[in-house]
């Protein structure tokens, strides 16, 4: 007996009703008294619904299933599943027996749209260029797990310094929290996009941060135009300098060196203190020269993997940055 079901999964939204289609071809003279129909969970073999001895035997699955009794005689053995829950997701097998026997399995894919993300900033006031800000994007009550993407105002993906967590509630729906850490530039737009991979539904929110600028204008940060060439195993100095104003003290200085592309932290000086190397303990500043505006970085025992662009961020009252390339030979 040939039993037919859809090849593709049946996608159903949480809380709605779903029809799991199943059909067979009745022979001439077929009567329902001859029909044995069983729906069961494919993996556990748990009975879901049955029709036998000419009668609907009812739901064995939380009283949320029904057949289409008026259509059975025409070969329609479909099952209606009401008020779909996340726990219903999976494979259902439709067994049909008349004189002969056939079966086929249909997949139910459950989905729930994610809410429009809400965005929060920490800190959220008195922001200045050079400050590190944590932006949190939260979206709720979706299923299955989301894909989360961050972009800047021109659509450039922001992939570094992102942490995403997804927690299921009692109903199995996910709440998504994604955190992006950024060093503020002059101003910037940050967008968070939460994508439901089953529904192909994109929910997005943006925040534009315009830091306060001091009247003096940006800090001018200077680096060499040409790449710094260093031999493998030797030490390299990535030069970076700024012009301190009269009365400048190191307590005012925030200095961050990071990899330009990935934004990975390399070395920092904040709150009047050298915060040390975040890069394999092979970097050092020139502490005695910082007060004169020398923010250069020493990179020890250069490796091939060090090659690339390093950005020097300097923030005093205002902010400036510049990138220097390291070429390894």
């Amino acid at each position: 007996l040939e039993v037919q079901v859809p090849e593709d999964p049946v996608v159903a939204l949480v809380g709605t009703d779903a029809t799991l289609c199943c059909s067979f071809s009745p022979e001439p003279g077929f009567s329902l008294a001859q029909l044995n129909l069983i729906w069961q969970l494919t993996d556990t073999k748990q009975l879901v619904h049955s029709f036998a001895e000419g009668q609907d035997q009812g739901s064995a699955y939380a009283n949320r299933t029904a057949l289409f009794p008026d259509l059975l005689a025409q070969g329609n053995a479909s099952l209606r599943l009401q008020r779909v829950r996340v726990a219903d997701e999976g494979s259902f097998t439709c067994f049909v027996s008349i004189r002969d026997f056939g079966s086929a399995a249909v997949s139910l894919q459950v989905a729930a749209p994610y809410s429009k993300p809400s965005m929060t900033l920490e800190p959220n006031k008195d922001l200045r260029p050079g400050d590190t800000v944590t932006i949190t994007c939260s979206s709720y009550q979706g299923y299955p797990e989301a894909e989360v993407f961050w972009q800047d105002g021109q659509g450039v993906p922001l992939t570094g310094n992102v942490t995403t967590s997804q927690m299921a509630n009692e109903q199995g729906l996910f709440d998504v929290h994604s955190i992006l850490r950024v060093v503020l530039g002059a101003n910037g737009t940050y967008s968070c996009l939460v994508r439901n991979p089953v529904l192909q539904q994109d929910a997005h929110s943006s925040v534009t941060i315009t830091p306060q600028r001091s009247p003096t204008g940006a800090v001018e940060v200077q680096v060499p135009e040409d790449p710094v060439v260093a031999l493998v195993g030797t030490d390299a100095t990535l030069r970076c300098s700024f012009s301190p104003e009269p009365g400048f003290s190191l307590a005012q200085l925030n200095l961050i060196w990071q990899l330009t592309d990935t934004k990975q932290l390399v070395h920092s000086f904040t709150e009047g203190r050298d915060q040390g190397s975040a890069y394999a303990n092979r970097t050092a500043l020139f502490p005695d020269l910082l007060a004169q505006g020398n923010a250069s970085l020493r990179l020890q025992r250069v490796r091939v993997a060090d090659e690339g662009s390093f950005t020097c961020f300097v923030s005093i009252r205002d902010f400036g940055s510049a990138a220097v390339s390291l070429q390894v030979a």
Epitope: F149, Q151, D152, G153, Q154, G155, V156, P157, L158, G185, G188, S191, L193, R195, P197, Q200, D202, H204, T260, D261, A323
Partner: antibody, heavy 122, light 107 residues
Framework: QVQLQQSGPELVRPGVSVKISCKVS????????MHWVKRSHAKSLEWIGI????????NYNQKFQGKATMTVDKSSSTAYMELARLTSEDSAIYYC???????????????WGQGTLVTVSA | DVQITQSPSYLTASPGETIIINCRAS??????LAWYQEKPGKTNKLLIY???TLQSGIPSRFSGSGSDTDFTLTISSLEPEDFAMYYC?????????FGAGTKLELK
């Protein structure tokens, strides 16, 4: 009208670097991101990366990480791409392209440069 | 990465005919697909984005359809200037990826 004018062809030796440029006219340079695309016989079209023309923020196709470096000069409305440690596999036409995105995670290209042919040969 | 399979790689037709080019994605990409035309000595031209949205200035004989994984570019009543190379590109996610191209030649 919108134009992306790329620098001329380059014939370079293996192992060296080359920097190609893309000068924009007909729209405000910093209004949208710039992408770079490689066209070779072996691999057809390959997306290299994207740069924010305002902030300089970049994102690279992992395949081109370490090979390509994108930069911009806002004062001259020019985007640059440097290709390092060239080999024969880098011989190709390189295009700059103005990206368009609409709240999705991806972009399409409304305008293209005419392409820069890079030939790597000893 | 999303792989894009474009077919056919080569196509011959005559002016006035209708042709169809197909692109298939290795995973569902909703309707995030663009089509381009490439001609020697000219800059690449965007024809269609988001599966079926015609770029301004492109003649209506070009149309795009499809969603999820299967997409088509249809050119009806071919004009002499339509003989060119055509590429599709997914703009669903990074890295952006292209089909291998279809060369449309005069029969």
């Amino acid at each position: 009208q919108v134009q992306l004018q790329q620098s001329g062809p380059e014939l370079v030796r293996p192992g060296v670097s080359v920097k190609i440029s893309c000068k924009v006219s007909g729209y405000t340079f910093t209004d949208g991101a710039m992408h770079w695309v490689k066209r070779s016989h072996a691999k057809s079209l390959e997306w290299i990366g994207i740069i924010n023309t305002n902030s300089g923020n970049t994102n690279y196709n992992q395949k081109f990480q370490g090979k390509a470096t994108m930069t911009v000069d806002k004062s001259s409305s020019t985007a640059y791409m440097e290709l390092a440690r060239l080999t024969s596999e880098d011989s190709a036409i390189y295009y700059c392209a103005r990206g368009v995105f609409y709240y999705g995670y991806g972009a399409w290209f409304a305008y293209w440069g005419q392409g820069t042919l890079v030939t790597v040969s000893a | 990465d999303v792989q894009i399979t474009q077919s056919p790689s080569y196509l011959t037709a005559s002016p006035g005919e209708t042709i169809i080019i197909n692109c298939r994605a290795s995973k569902t990409i909703s309707n995030y697909l663009a089509w381009y035309q490439e001609k020697p000595g000219k800059t690449n031209k965007l024809l269609i984005y988001s599966g079926s949205t015609l770029q301004s200035g492109i003649p209506s004989r070009f149309s795009g359809s499809g969603s999820d994984t299967d997409f088509t570019l249809t050119i009806s009543s071919l004009e002499p200037e339509d003989f060119a190379m055509y590429y599709c590109q997914q703009h669903h996610e990074y890295p952006l990826t292209f089909g291998a191209g279809t060369k449309l030649e005069l029969k």
